[in-house]
């Protein structure tokens, strides 16, 4: 019968010929009367056999990630008779893994959007690296993730690649962050290989800013001949939020005389001061009104940012018109 052990050859061996093992018949008494032959894919080109002894050699550098096993056939012939001593047999040469592949992030580029002011622990995104080395061979493909850039705002779970928020962020201070994640094989031990990826994390806006008047005091004038409904001027607040969160409504907070109104131009986000009642210079020629501004949409959980509406004072001077 045939006698052999399981055959392994390490990948990436640089030697010109590497002894893998011996293949022999138990009828071989060592007098060189038998001839061993190797057949199949790789025979002669990748592997050779010593015809007399049955010793098998790898004569080419192998890459396990390209091909991890070779199935070959062996024959043994009696030189004197030319007959097979043993029936032809199939055997396997396995290419054993070395840590020659760094982890790679295949789903690049990574981009995530997370609301500003999200609490610590909020999941942002999961990044996953893959390692072409053999996961069943030691730690060659066992990865650990770490954060190279992004502290103190982000953290990464070492074994899963899940990125979480570790510190609240304010979009109005910075609206996007580049996080760099490293994946290291060999669970970070010496000889480990690594790969990195960048994650662009954008902060979406939440309504955490109330509108504030640009001026604490405005001065407007109105002619006593102005009809009701006349626009006598504009006031403006600014809101550091964006989009819907920056939409605002202006209103009168104080006007004892009930002479003026304020409407909101939702396109320009300006407040337009309107004459509600005709004025009479001889009766009153100086008015003071207080206006306030509030956001249009404020979710209940964000009301804490909107406790006191911004106000401004508007001095309105009536201009005299000579009466006939």
């Amino acid at each position: 019968g045939w006698v052999w052990n399981q055959f392994f050859v390490p990948e990436e061996m640089n030697t010109t010929s590497h002894h893998i093992g011996q293949l022999r018949s138990d009828l071989d008494n060592g007098n060189n009367s038998f001839q061993y032959k190797l057949l199949g894919a790789g025979a002669g080109s990748t592997f050779i056999i010593d015809e007399r002894t049955g010793d098998i050699y790898a004569i080419q550098k192998l890459d396990r990630e390209e091909r991890s096993l070779y199935i070959l056939r062996a024959q043994v012939i009696d030189i004197a008779t030319g007959r097979a001593v043993e029936p032809e047999s199939e055997f396997v040469i396995k290419v054993s893994d070395i840590n020659d592949n760094e982890p790679k992030f295949l789903d690049e580029p990574y981009e995530a959007i997370v609301p500003e002011m999200s609490p610590e622990g909020t999941l942002v995104i999961q990044v996953t690296a893959s390692d072409a080395d053999d996961p069943s061979s030691g730690n060659n493909a066992r990865l650990l993730y770490s954060l190279l850039q992004g502290q103190p705002y982000f953290s990464v779970e070492p074994t899963t690649g899940v990125i979480r928020i570790s510190s609240k962020m304010d979009r109005e201070l910075q609206d996007e962050y580049w996080v760099i994640i490293q994946a290291k094989d060999m669970i970070g031990q010496p000889g480990a290989l690594s790969g990195t990826t960048s994650v662009l994390i954008k902060l979406s806006d939440v309504n955490d800013n109330k509108p504030i008047f640009k001026e604490s005091l405005y001065r407007l004038t109105v002619s006593e001949s102005a009809p009701t409904g006349t626009s006598i001027g504009t006031i403006m607040a600014y809101d550091n939020d964006i989009g819907e969160n920056a939409e605002m409504d202006y209103s009168i907070e104080e006007d004892d005389s009930q002479t003026f109104d304020i409407i909101t131009n939702h396109e320009t986000q300006e407040g337009i001061v309107i004459l509600k009642k005709k004025v009479d210079f001889e009766h009153q020629n100086h008015y003071g009104i207080r206006a306030k501004v509030k956001n249009h949409h404020v979710p209940e959980q964000l009301m804490k940012y909107h406790t006191e509406a911004s106000t401004t004072f508007i001095k309105i001077q009536v201009e005299d018109v000579d009466e006939p």
Epitope: E215, Y218, E254, S257, H286, G288, F313
Partner: antibody, heavy 120, light 107 residues
Framework: QVQLQESGPGLVKPSQTLSLTCTVS??????????WSWIRQHPGKGLEWIGY???????YYNPSLKSRVTISVDTSKNQFSLKLSSVTAADTAVYYC????????????WGQGTLVTVSS | EIVLTQSPGTLSLSPGERATLSCRAS???????LAWYQQKPGQAPRLLIY???SRATGIPDRFSGSGSGTDFTLTISRLEPEDFAVYYC????????FGQGTKVDIK
């Protein structure tokens, strides 16, 4: 803190023009929404508002003095001025410059006042 | 023009007493357009109250203002020695006019 300081001659002859200047410090005369006034007080009497000016040059005067009063502004010097023409002894008074308030037309800041006597 | 009449002309009180000063307008004015000032000899008037019950910066809370329509009041709840002075009301709705003043002196 806004401070105002009146300056000008303490003695003016009848029929001449009284000229006073108010220098503003601790704030800009061009601040939006503020009006700069002149007010006077006859000896031992009450207060009389003369007129005001806005930094743009828009002025408004007490109707009883309107024909004789001119108030002007010089934003580069942070000053505003009063001219009162054709003075008589009845114009003898302490003249104050003042700035109105941030929540109304009341007078929040005042100069210390300067006495102008009209006499030949 | 709106004429403001203050009464009494002189109020003689002792320190610690309550002072009530009146200001009456010749026609109705909004309470938002009335102010009170204090003036001591040789000094400029000092804003006390505006609108008509808001205290100006640095004014102690013993000073308070009230009123509406044509009748307005300045109250000094407990007179301090430094409160003896002349007090003026002023309206700033129709041009600007002052009352003739009330003198608060030591009895």
């Amino acid at each position: 803190q806004v401070q105002l300081q009146e300056s000008g001659p303490g003695l003016v002859k009848p029929s001449q023009t009284l000229s006073l200047t108010c220098t503003v410090s601790g704030g800009s005369i061009s601040s939006s929404g503020y009006y700069w006034s002149w007010i006077r007080q006859h000896p031992g009497k009450g207060l009389e508002w003369i007129g005001y000016i806005y930094y743009t040059g828009s002025a408004y005067y007490n109707p009883s003095l309107k024909s004789r009063v001119t108030i002007s502004v010089d934003t580069s010097k942070n000053q505003f001025s009063l001219k009162l023409s054709s003075v008589t002894a009845a114009d003898t008074a302490v003249y104050y410059c003042a700035r109105d308030g941030s929540s109304g037309w009341y007078f929040q800041y005042w100069g210390q006042g300067t006495l102008v006597t009209v006499s030949s | 023009e709106i004429v403001l009449t203050q009464s009494p002309g002189t109020l003689s009180l002792s320190p610690g007493e309550r002072a009530t000063l009146s200001c009456r307008a010749s026609r109705q004015i909004s309470s938002s357009y009335l102010a009170w000032y204090q003036q001591k000899p040789g000094q400029a008037p000092r804003l006390l109250i505006y609108g008509p019950s808001s205290r100006a910066t640095g004014i102690p809370d013993r000073f308070s203002g009230s009123g509406s329509g044509t009748d307005f009041t300045l109250t000094i709840s407990r007179l301090e020695p430094e409160d003896f002075a002349v007090y003026y009301c002023q309206q700033y709705g129709s041009s600007f006019t002052f009352g003739q003043g009330t003198k608060v002196d030591i009895k």
